[in-house]
């Protein structure tokens, strides 16, 4: 029997064992987080699947993910939201130590999808494990990109108090308007709920003593945020290794000096 024709995309296909992975992650998350014990993981998977299965994978919309967002609704306490841009690993290492702060990937929906790829095919109930649309080469309205845009928008919209963002000081554009942070989250912080955005610029080189808070792209971020009536603060994190160590052991004598 000849295999049925399948759309070829430029990106890698759906992550192996995607349904099992999502379900297993959901069960694990709800076991570890008492406030989410009421979540029915089968319903969550059904809503996740419903967002992209049998739909043309270059025509996915935010609306498609709203049922999943509805089931995964979670609140972060004020002052406890940590956004990040191009420095995911350090942000996650930080919240693993500072347990009362949360990145998107510490929330149920972000946790379910972190590092996974998925897509379906128009008019079939199959998942495409061969290839999925690439954001640049194929289309931006693909299942993965739209998912992250949707949940990132919601995460920013619900933030309150002082919001923190970790930025990568080693990149040519420390603040990139085209990143998810720059294109989605910045514009969805609610001025009536968010008093300030505090940027932590993470230095890469050990001998780098420049004040990266004076970088032109940081000034651009400050301008965008200030125009939205949200105060802006910036801190250099010169030694990320020491920074993490001091989060773990704040009483350490070396932590009294700058990091």
């Amino acid at each position: 029997v000849l295999p049925r024709w399948r759309q070829q995309w430029s990106g890698s296909g759906t992550t192996s064992r995607f349904p099992e992975t999502v379900l297993a992650r959901c069960v694990k998350y709800t076991e570890v987080h008492p406030e989410m014990r009421h979540v029915d993981c089968q319903s969550v998977w059904d809503a996740f699947k419903g967002a992209f299965i049998s739909k043309y994978p270059c025509n996915i919309t935010e609306e498609d993910y709203q049922p999943l967002v509805k089931l995964g609704t979670q609140t972060v306490p004020c002052n406890k939201t940590l956004l990040w841009s191009r420095i995911k690993d350090l942000a996650h290492q930080f919240t693993q130590v500072q347990r009362d702060m949360f990145t998107l990937e510490d929330m149920l929906l972000g946790y379910l999808a972190d590092d996974l790829t998925w897509c379906g095919e128009f008019n079939t109930f199959e998942i495409n494990y061969q290839s999925c649309p690439d954001w640049r080469k194929d289309c931006s309205n693909n299942p993965v990109s739209v998912f992250w845009k949707t949940v990132s928008r919601r995460f920013a919209e619900t933030a309150c108090g002082v919001v923190h963002v970790m930025l990568n000081g080693s990149r040519s554009k420390i603040f990139d308007k085209n990143s998810t942070f720059g294109s989605v989250e910045v514009h969805n912080l609610q001025p009536e709920k968010v008093q300030a955005l505090e940027a932590w610029v993470i230095h890469g080189g050990r001998e780098d003593s420049r004040d990266l808070c004076q970088d032109p792209t940081i000034k651009e971020l400050e301008s965008i945020i200030s125009k939205r009536n949200i105060r802006f603060f910036c801190k250099n994190i010169y030694r990320p290794d020491k920074f993490l160590q001091c989060v773990k052991n704040p009483e350490d004598s070396s932590c009294l000096s700058g990091i």
Epitope: D40, S43, D46, E62, E63, Q66, P67, V69, T150
Partner: antibody, heavy 119, light 107 residues
Framework: EVQLLESGGDLVQPGGSLRLSCGAS????????MSWVRQAPGKGLEWVAD????????WYADSVKGRFTISRDNSENTLYLQMNSLRAEDTAVYYC????????????WGQGTTVTVSS | QSVLTQAPSASGTPGQRVTISCSGS??????VSWYQQLPGTAPKLLIY???ERPSGVPDRFSASKSGTSASLAISGLQSGDEADYYC??????????FGGGTKLTVL
């Protein structure tokens, strides 16, 4: 034929209770989110409550939160609305409706059952 | 107070094209559906998922959505189209919300 049939509407005194039922036929009831929507005399439609396909999640309008409870029995293909602490402003025709793929729209409606709250 | 705003009334003569609008911030990221309620009857789904028609709904009924507003167009107006028309969507809390309704009169 796809059908929803409400029952249980009545005249009840303020502070009283009532349970509405909605029987479903012609579709796989357990696959669909369901809603209750009401319409006060001469007024527009007002969403009241939703329940997920498996019954594990429920959502309510602020106006009924803490007083009304939506539930379902998938083995009996029946949707319920338990209404307690009824007020005059709860007087309305109550419709049950099937949700098409969560948020596409409400594609099947019952004929409605009338609840009157008055002393 | 509904977060979806509709004009209370609209009118047209037989054969004409009329448009009913619906606006609200939650429309931007949520599907819009449209319902027709003939006098003394239950609502009926006319449009789902912003612009799609269920089978059995004539193609005289069409809809569109742009940004925070949506509209329903009825062409070739007939006396039988006289009814109340409601838009619906999910609100910012991801719960259903209906517009206040537009009463369509065929002159």
């Amino acid at each position: 034929e796809v059908q929803l049939l409400e029952s249980g509407g009545d005249l009840v005194q303020p502070g009283g209770s009532l349970r509405l039922s909605c029987g479903a036929s012609g579709f796989t009831f357990s696959d669909h989110y369901m809603s209750w929507v009401r319409q006060a005399p001469g007024k527009g439609l007002e969403w009241v409550a939703d329940i997920s396909a498996r019954g594990s999640n429920t959502w309510y309008a602020d106006s009924v939160k803490g007083r009304f409870t939506i539930s379902r029995d998938n083995s009996e293909n029946t949707l319920y609305l338990q209404m307690n602490s009824l007020r005059a402003e709860d007087t309305a025709v109550y419709y049950c409706a099937k949700n098409w793929n969560y948020n596409y729209g409400m594609d099947v409606w019952g004929q409605g059952t009338t609840v009157t709250v008055s002393s | 107070q509904s977060v979806l705003t509709q004009a209370p009334s609209a009118s047209g003569t037989p054969g004409q094209r009329v448009t009913i609008s619906c606006s609200g911030s939650s429309i931007q990221n949520n599907y819009v559906s449209w319902y027709q309620q003939l006098p003394g009857t239950a609502p009926k789904l006319l449009i789902y998922r912003n612009f799609e028609r269920p089978s059995g709904v004539p193609d005289r009924f069409s809809a569109s959505k742009s940004g925070t507003s949506a509209s329903l167009a009825i062409s070739g107006l007939q006396s039988g189209d006289e009814a109340d028309y409601y838009c619906a969507s999910w609100d910012d809390s991801l719960n259903w919300v209906f517009g206040g309704g537009t009463k369509l009169t065929v002159l």
